[in-house]
């Protein structure tokens, strides 16, 4: 014969536990029903009556099957440096995460307690570790042969363009400026006519003559005095 299915409330067999989504009520000494997420226990069970559940009120929630007398309060509204990535509902708490360009300097169980702006690397310095949701940017000086002319939390140092003839050599905060050695080819109307560099950047699609010898500039350039360690700006 199949075992009889017990309906809550029921007294458990000695040594056994209550089933899934049930809890043992110490007062009634019975296995009773839990309340579903979004509800709480309005009336606890007795030996003869099961738990009475009620919906959570506005701005309160329960995320799990439970038998709590009151729902939990949702967290406070997200601050101006945060975005609400999960709204407060009867079944889940509000989650605030840092808005783009910020990172979480102090986290809490879910979401973030304190956001801070991502560090910006000043000219001559590039991003050596991109920021994440929970970690700040790390800036490092641009290596010889590379530059960054921006104040940015995302820009890495980029190689100087290679010129047939250099007008102004590049440095850590400025790209090399090339001298135009041939007439600039025709461009679309209104286009700015700039000297054509022999670029190290592959997104420059024009065919470029290659210098007969192109050793790595990082091997050629002497290391100057080290720039100051603070390669970042707080703004």
């Amino acid at each position: 014969l199949p075992a009889q299915v017990a309906f809550t409330p029921y007294a458990p067999e000695p040594g056994s536990t209550c089933r899934l989504r049930e809890y043992y009520d110490q007062t009634a000494q019975m296995c009773c029903s839990k309340c579903s997420p979004g509800q709480h226990a309005k009336v606890f069970c007795t030996k003869t009556s099961d738990t009475v559940c009620d919906s959570c009120e506005d701005s309160t929630y329960t995320q799990l099957w439970n038998w709590v007398p009151e729902c939990l309060s949702c967290g406070s509204r997200c601050s101006s440096d945060q975005v609400e990535t999960q709204a407060c509902t009867r079944e889940q708490n509000r989650i605030c995460t840092c808005r783009p360009g910020w990172y979480c300097a102090l986290s809490k169980q879910e979401g973030c307690r304190l956001c801070a702006p991502l560090r910006k690397c000043r000219p001559g310095f590039g991003v050596a570790r991109p920021g994440t949701e929970t970690s700040d940017v790390v800036c490092k000086p641009c290596a010889p042969g590379t530059f960054s002319n921006t104040t940015s939390s995302t820009d890495i140092c980029r190689p100087h363009q290679i010129c047939n003839v250099v007008a102004i050599p590049g440095n850590a905060s400025m790209d090399a400026v090339c001298t135009s050695t041939s007439p600039t080819r025709s461009m679309a109307p209104g286009a700015v006519h700039l000297p054509q560099p022999v670029s190290t950047r592959s997104q420059h699609t024009q065919p470029t003559p290659e210098p007969s010898t192109a050793p790595s500039t990082s091997f050629l350039l002497p290391m100057g005095p080290s720039p100051p360690a603070e390669g970042s700006t707080g703004d």
């Epitope: 570790r129 490092k140 290391m223």
Partner: antibody, heavy 118, light 109 residues
Framework: EVQLVQSGAEVKKPGATVKISCKVS????????IHWVQQAPGKGLEWIGR????????EYAEKFQGRVTITADTSTDTAYMELSSLRSEDTAVYYC???????????WGQGTTVTVSS | QAVVTQEPSLTVSPGGTVTLTCRSS?????????ANWVQQKPGQAFRGLIG???DRAPGVPARFSGSLLGGKAALTLSGAQPEDEAEYYC?????????FGGGTKLTVL
């Protein structure tokens, strides 16, 4: 002249720990991350981790997490990579490098061969 | 940890064009992976060729170019030279660590 000079070859027993050094010269060690990369015989490159000598912060590959410690001593311009609980598959050449993927400051040590054998 | 996959080997004729690719197990490769390409010639030091997906490192010949192609990082060699025969590794950045691909052995034949 930029140089990264690594310590000599090591032979270790399984379970032992090895510590390799990488002495840098020709640049300010605080200006660039120092990376460690593994190349097992006949295999490709495996990134182990990197240290920011300026503040000692480290990042490690998941595969080596818990077994590897990368440090840098700015007073001697030396970076170190310590790998513990060695096993036979750790037999490889280990390189220190300023290659960073972000900086184009591309220098490599000569490599240190570590042989793990009982 | 993510797995980065490359073609184990490719062959190109001298003067020909070949594209090496680099796939990520976590989804399409984006500029946030800062794709890098590193060259290893037998008995020589490693050499970074491409960084930031498509920037050639200083001194790298213009015949090497980097791009994103169909959700993968790509290294294109146009006008291959015998001296380009080498092992090529791609490396992708994942939030706080680099992962190298298995490498592509390029033969110029």
């Amino acid at each position: 002249e930029v140089q990264l000079v690594q310590s000599g070859a090591e032979v270790k027993k399984p379970g032992a720990t090895v510590k390799i050094s990488c002495k840098v010269s020709g640049f300010n060690i605080k200006d660039f991350y120092i990376h460690w990369v593994q190349q097992a015989p006949g295999k490709g490159l495996e990134w182990i981790g990197r240290v920011d000598p300026e503040d000692g912060n480290t990042e490690y590959a998941e595969k080596f997490q818990g077994r590897v410690t990368i440090t840098a001593d700015t007073s001697t311009d030396t970076a170190y990579m310590e790998l513990s609980s060695l096993r036979s598959e750790d037999t490889a050449v280990y390189y220190c490098s300023t290659w960073d993927g972000f900086s184009y400051f591309d220098y490599w040590g000569q490599g240190t061969t570590v042989t793990v054998s009982s | 940890q993510a797995v980065v996959t490359q073609e184990p080997s490719l062959t190109v004729s001298p003067g020909g064009t070949v594209t090496l690719t680099c796939r990520s197990s976590t989804g399409p490769v984006t500029t946030n992976n800062y794709a890098n390409w590193v060259q290893q010639k037998p008995g020589q030091a490693f050499r970074g060729l491409i960084g930031g997906t498509n920037d050639r490192a200083p001194g790298v010949p213009a015949r090497f170019s980097g791009s994103l192609l169909g959700g993968k990082a790509a290294l294109t060699l146009s006008g291959a030279q015998p001296e380009d025969e080498a092992e090529y590794y791609c490396a992708l950045w994942y939030r706080n660590h680099w992962v190298f691909g298995g490498g592509t052995k390029l033969t110029v034949l």
